[in-house]
């Protein structure tokens, strides 16, 4: 190859040599590598203002390897792509672009949303909740006895949390008032509180019983209607009358 160095060859071609270093098959003083040994990839390396050919076993970031018969080269990924598998398949986009099916997009297609952590277009995920649990026993202050009006609760789990553009999750608990046939607490259940309850029974009967637990999302309200309040007042009056008869004292009662 180097044998002939006629006028035409000097004009047309830089000095080509096969006594090269670092993976070059052919090289020149001015250009560095011209071609590479088998399985190595040619790439132009920018050194200051100069570009010289080098031969590498794998391509640098921003390039992918192209193989043709006896000639391999590192080829630049597309302008918006940082790392690619081949010309048409990007695996990491440059800043400000989102990856979708191997392409780099400045905004995600309809039905998809940008994940700003992975810089990928991902499917919009809506919240998914489980079925409601059964209602809990009717309780008041952690007890299921010694009262007539209490609250019961049911819950559900979040099976799938939503993505940024997904539907928000519904409430995970629901509470409502409940009325039970009043039963006395057994000795074990009563304890100190049970004895106190006996002493304060009359006062407690007078006290208005309320219950609440409505989620911020606005589920069932436990506020009583005017009819319910009127009923309650009647019941309380009847109870007072019965006590008054027992005490053999006469009182005048006014109906509200």
């Amino acid at each position: 190859q180097n044998a002939s160095r006629g006028r035409r060859q000097r004009r047309m071609h830089p000095n080509v040599s096969q006594g090269c270093q670092g993976g070059c098959a052919t090289c020149s003083d001015y250009n560095g590598c011209l071609s590479c040994k088998p399985r190595l990839f040619f790439v132009l390396e920018r050194i200051g203002m100069k570009q010289i050919g080098v031969c590498l076993s794998s391509c640098p970031s921003g390039y992918y390897g192209t193989r043709y018969p006896d000639i391999n080269k590192c080829t630049k990924c597309k302008v918006d792509c940082d790392t690619c598998f081949n010309k048409n398949f990007c695996t990491k986009c440059k800043s400000g672009f989102y990856l979708h099916l191997g392409k780099c997009l400045d905004s995600c297609p309809e039905g998809l949303e940008a994940n700003n952590h992975t810089m990928e277009c991902v499917s919009i995920v809506h919240c998914e909740a489980s079925e409601w649990s059964p209602w809990s026993p009717c309780m008041k202050k952690g007890k299921t006895c010694g009262f007539k009006r209490g609250t019961e609760t049911r819950v559900r789990d979040i099976l799938q949390h939503p993505s940024a553009k997904g539907n928000l999750c519904p409430p995970t608990s629901e509470t409502r008032t409940c009325i039970v046939q009043r039963k006395k607490c057994s000795k074990g259940e009563r304890g100190k509180k049970g004895r106190e309850r006996k002493r304060k029974k009359l006062n407690k009967e007078e006290r208005k019983e309320t219950s609440s637990s409505s989620d911020s999302k606005g589920l069932e309200s436990s506020i009583e209607t005017p009819d319910q309040q009127e009923n309650k007042e009647r019941q309380q009056q009847q109870k007072r009358r019965a006590r008054d008869k027992q005490q053999k004292s006469v009182s005048v009662s006014t109906v509200h």
Epitope: S4, C33, F42, Q51, I52, D70
Partner: antibody, heavy 119, light 107 residues
Framework: EVQLQESGPSLVKPSQTLSLTCSVT????????WSWIRKFPGNKLEFMGY???????YYIPSLKSRVSITRDTSKNQYYLQLNSVTTEDTATYYC?????????????WGQGTLVTVSS | DIKMTQSPSSMYASLGERVTITCKAS??????LSWFQQKPGKSPKTLIY???RLIDGVPSRFSGSGSGQDYSLTINSLEYEDMGIYYC?????????FGAGTRLEIK
């Protein structure tokens, strides 16, 4: 001095095979890449393919089914065969060489041979 | 295939004039671009490779520049012997492809 010289028939009948030879002096075909290029009457240049220093070949997709490039290292010659020619294959055929991506592509050309496809 | 769009397709210029021919690739070709000159009845002759590297023996009035998709060949002061057809070639990717050519004639 590296020189390339094309030879072969200047007239080929449609449906026949076009066969050309490129004789190389001043360099060995066991080094570098040895190509065929053609120039159509409207001045359009088309690269057709190459045979490498080891004898491996590359053909452009549009010609792959009917082109073949072979070589004879003992004669330092390489060859072009184009099957099932039509009048569209009328062109000046050149052989040319290059040494790789870091150097000039097609630094050396043959003088070209005009092949007319006509019945 | 990468398409090379060369312009103008033909031009007339005066001796001593500065002439510029451009080539636009359909995608980034990373500086793998050559320029050729072909005169009537002759084979093409390489002028420039890797965008801006002048072949030994080519007059210094020829220069090349560009990057990405856009490249140009400039003849600083046109001489009579510069008439002919000029072609660009991309060799970033196979199949390598040529521009359609620019016919340069002297006014």
């Amino acid at each position: 001095e590296v020189q390339l010289q094309e030879s072969g028939p200047s007239l080929v009948k449609p449906s026949q095979t076009l066969s050309l030879t490129c004789s190389v002096t001043g360099d060995s075909i066991t080094s570098g890449y040895w190509s065929w290029i053609r120039k159509f009457p409207g001045n359009k240049l088309e690269f057709m393919g190459y045979i490498s220093f080891s004898g491996k070949t590359y053909y452009i997709p549009s010609l792959k089914s009917r082109v073949s490039i072979t070589r004879d290292t003992s004669k330092n010659q390489y060859y072009l065969q184009l099957n099932s020619v039509t009048t569209e294959d009328t062109a000046t055929y050149y052989c040319a060489t290059y040494h790789g991506y870091g150097g000039p592509w097609f630094a050396y050309w043959g003088q070209g041979t005009l092949v007319t496809v006509s019945s | 295939d990468i398409k090379m769009t060369q312009s103008p397709s033909s031009m007339y210029a005066s001796l001593g004039e500065r002439v510029t021919i451009t080539c636009k690739a359909s995608q980034d070709i990373d500086s793998y671009l050559s320029w050729f000159q072909q005169k009537p009845g002759k084979s093409p002759k390489t002028l420039i490779y890797l965008t801006n590297r002048l072949i030994d023996g080519v007059p210094s009035r020829f220069s090349g520049s560009g990057s990405g998709q856009d490249y140009s060949l400039t003849i600083n002061s046109l001489e009579y012997e510069d008439m002919g057809i000029y072609y660009c070639l991309q060799y970033d990717e196979f199949p390598v492809t040529f521009g359609a050519g620019t016919r340069l004639e002297i006014k």
